[in-house]
């Protein structure tokens, strides 16, 4: 049909920085580059109906559905969503095309469905149909990458069976220790699945998708390094592939490497060797031991021997299911107000854990560091000297682990007071938990030295606010003290704090804070 307009439907994904419901807009916010939804005429439909490609959106994502109309003259429009009409304000771009937009901010289930756009131009009327659904992230997975030898080549392939398809990258480092941290200049990243350069000091493969990033390190024994004090240990689950690399450098090429499992040479097909020149004409040799799918009987001591280096071993342990080994007993700490202190959990786990530190219902990122003895450690130092209960939670595919910590900050009590018609109460959060005294101020005792013992009720731990104990003391009002000033004092090994209360009639009481160190 000659009169049909040329139309283009696009999807624009936005960086989220707003929260609102779907709204029609003529000027969408700054965004990513548009994705063509290829509006096509819907066959066998009554009237002129264009259908855009289905749109899948992440929960909370923000998008704009946009139609560009190349038709002469003015246009008018109307959006319809779930039988409700939504206002539509077309405008014209620099190429004089009509532009109609629907902005959906912070996508929710209620905003999924069919969006119909009715457009009326001078020449014709037509409808555009958009179907918007929420991406089913329940099906998403991110699996730790593993290695395979590339068929008939001296190369490793990195595989991560994840949904959506992950981006795979090799993370290579050629220096020792700390300088191999992720953002160090010594680290080189290669966004490819196959790696031919297998001689580096530290080789890791990482896979990332919408769920995050998982990495696997190529387990390496370096015969030129002093062996660790404890035997390196590698855990694997039944069915997983085993890869161990043995590496050695020597002044010339006259040396060889061999792998043995429990003093028996590995079968052919379970190893391969490579060599290349290193600095000052020395020769690097690497020998890989690999099993494509491990069984329980692959457990044992794998020893790499060289004709020119002392041999070194690693203990490979094959387990039926993953584990997290750590002591889960709760731990209490008391520290001074300015003392440097970190919580720490030492654990052994396979597969690698995901973890969080939680305090006062707020979660904090959790970093873990491998120790030489096969254990890992996670530390949390960002407590800002806030007393209370801190929780370390760790999990992997097969196990969960939770450990509680209580942090007490040694400090002088701070006293808060309140009073009603029948009683006066004082509260303090100092640590160690304070003891209380009440004193009556009178003509006989202007310095408030007359102690009150009758009608006093102390509660050592009145309420627990995220593990922070609050001590309270209540004085029941009697005729003997009505109309007098009374003083409650909280004291511990670090000092004393007092509040003075006028016990007259109900209402706002004047409180006078009185700090005595």
């Amino acid at each position: 049909n000659q009169d049909l307009p040329v139309i283009k439907c696009v999807l624009i994904n936005h960086k989220n920085n707003d929260s609102s419901v779907g709204k029609s807009s003529s000027y969408p916010m700054v965004s990513e580059s548009p994705e063509d939804l290829g509006c096509a005429l819907r066959p066998q439909s009554s009237g002129t109906v264009y259908e855009a490609a289905a749109v899948e959106v992440d929960v909370s994502a923000s998008i704009t559905l946009q139609v560009l109309v190349d038709a002469p003259g003015n246009i008018s429009c109307l959006w319809v969503f779930k039988h409700s009409s939504l206002n539509c304000q077309p405008h014209f771009d620099l190429q004089n095309r009509g532009v109609v937009s629907m902005v959906i901010l912070k996508m929710t289930e209620t905003q999924a469905g069919e969006y119909l756009l009715f457009i009326q131009s001078e020449a014709t009327n037509y409808t555009i149909l958009f179907t918007v659904s929420i991406r089913n992230t329940l099906l998403y997975t991110l699996r730790r990458p593993y290695f395979r030898k590339m068929e008939n080549q001296d190369a490793l392939v990195c595989i991560s069976e994840s949904v959506p398809e992950p981006i795979v990258e090799w993370v290579l480092c050629d220096s020792q220790g700390e300088s191999c941290k992720e953002e160090s200049p010594a680290v080189v990243k290669k966004e490819e699945k196959v790696l031919h350069e297998l001689f580096g000091t530290d080789i890791r493969c990482c896979a990332r998708n919408e769920l995050g990033r998982e990495c696997t390190r190529l387990f390496t024994i370096d015969l030129n390094q002093t062996p660790q004090t404890t035997l390196p240990q590698l855990f694997l689950k039944v069915g997983e592939p085993l890869w161990i690399r043995c590496k050695a450098v020597h002044v010339n090429h006259g040396f060889g490497l061999t792998w043995e499992l429990e003093n028996k040479a590995l079968e052919e097909g379970n190893y391969f060797e490579m060599s290349t020149y290193s600095t000052n004409r020395t020769m690097i040799r690497i020998l890989f031991a690999f099993v494509s799918s491990v069984a329980r009987n692959d457990t044992g001591y794998y020893t790499c021997s060289s004709s020119k280096h002392p041999s070194q071993s690693a203990l490979v342990t094959i387990v039926e299911k993953g584990f997290i080994n750590a002591t889960n007993s709760s731990e209490d700490y008391e520290i001074d107000q300015y003392e440097e202190f970190c919580f720490s959990v030492r654990f052994k786990a396979y597969p690698q854990i995901r973890c969080t530190w939680t305090f006062s219902r707020k979660s904090f990122p959790c970093e873990q560091k491998g120790l030489d003895n096969g254990y890992s450690i996670s530390k949390f130092c960002n407590h800002k000297h806030q007393p209370g209960e801190y929780i370390f939670h760790a999990e992997n595919d097969d196990a969960q682990f939770t450990k509680m910590f209580t942090l007490n900050i040694r400090r002088k009590p701070q006293v808060l007071a309140e009073a009603s018609a029948s009683q006066a109460s004082c509260f303090s959060d100092g640590y160690p938990l304070p003891s209380w005294t009440w004193k009556k101020c009178s003509d006989k005792s202007p310095n408030c030295t007359e102690e009150i013992t009758e009608g006093v009720w102390n509660r050592k731990a009145n309420r627990k606010v995220f593990g922070q104990w609050v001590s309270s003391s209540t004085l029941n009002m009697s005729e003997a003290i009505k109309g007098f000033l009374v003083k409650c004092c909280a004291y511990n090994s670090l000092g004393t704090s007092c509040e003075t209360i006028l016990l007259n009639s109900p209402g706002p009481f004047p409180f006078i804070q009185d700090n005595i160190s």
């Epitope: 008939n152 080549q153 090429h253 060889g256 391969f272 060599s275 600095t279």
Partner: antibody, heavy 119, light 112 residues
Framework: QVQLVQSGAEVKKPGASVKVSCKAS????????MHWVRQAPGQGLEWMGI????????VYAQTFQGRVTMTRDTSTSTVYMELSSLRSEDTAVYYC????????????WGQGTMVTVSS | DIVMTQSPLSLPVTPGEPASISCRSS???????????LDWYLQKPGQSPQLLIY???NRASGVPDRFSGSGSGTDFTLKISRVEAEDVGVYYC?????????FGQGTRLEIK
């Protein structure tokens, strides 16, 4: 001492295949790469490919891709080079050579095997 | 493929005199590890080739010290300080940086 001993001369018809062997001795077979190089009569040297005896990985020159197969037998410390669909231009001396690393440095060479392709 | 060009193709030398052979590659043979992947081979009449120099300037074991290699990147030179009668044959340079490894066309050294 370290040496590479190759199989004897061969005469083949065009279209046939030839399999040349190279037996290594005097060193640990799996720790050095093995290359194959050929030399047509009166011509220069031409690299054909490489095999890693440890694992059997191979890389072939594009010129021979699809026609050459390099294999090894670790039990006898022998590598093999098979060239198929022979033509008269394949008439040459075929050498196996031990590579110190994967990138060249052919320090030990076999004595060469003369392959003649003639109808 | 990397193209290797040798010059001269023929080199008549008087015994005791020095000799020099040049080899040029179509692209740099300098690897990121600092090595130049260039080897020199000598093929004596009726024999298999033998390794003289590897990694541009390193003499192979058993090679007399009158042979030396130099150069970097794309330009390399093999020098013989005093030619002896046993040095006759064809000298080849070869790049080992990337497959397919390629040889120069050869330089025939003969005694005058």
């Amino acid at each position: 001492q370290v040496q590479l001993v190759q199989s004897g001369a061969e005469v083949k018809k065009p279209g046939a295949s030839v399999k040349v062997s190279c037996k290594a001795s005097g060193y640990t077979f799996t720790i050095y790469y093995m290359h194959w190089v050929r030399q047509a009569p009166g011509q220069g040297l031409e690299w054909m490919g490489i095999i890693n005896p440890s694992g059997g990985s191979t890389v072939y020159a594009q010129t021979f891709q699809g026609r050459v197969t390099m294999t090894r037998d670790t039990s006898t410390s022998t590598v093999y080079m098979e060239l198929s669909s022979l033509r008269s231009e394949d008439t040459a001396v075929y050498y196996c050579a031990r590579g110190i690393g994967s990138k060249g440095a052919f320090d030990i060479w076999g004595q060469g095997t003369m392959v003649t392709v003639s109808s | 493929d990397i193209v290797m060009t040798q010059s001269p193709l023929s080199l008549p030398v008087t015994p005791g005199e020095p000799a020099s052979i040049s080899c040029r590659s179509s692209q740099s043979l300098l690897h990121s590890n600092g090595y130049n992947y260039l080897d020199w081979y000598l093929q004596k009449p009726g024999q298999s080739p033998q390794l003289l120099i590897y990694l541009g300037s390193n003499r192979a074991s058993g090679v007399p010290d009158r042979f030396s290699g130099s150069g970097s990147g794309t330009d390399f030179t093999l020098k013989i300080s005093r030619v002896e009668a046993e040095d006759v044959g064809v000298y080849y340079c070869m790049q080992g940086l990337q497959t397919p490894y390629t040889f120069g066309q050869g330089t025939r050294l003969e005694i005058k």
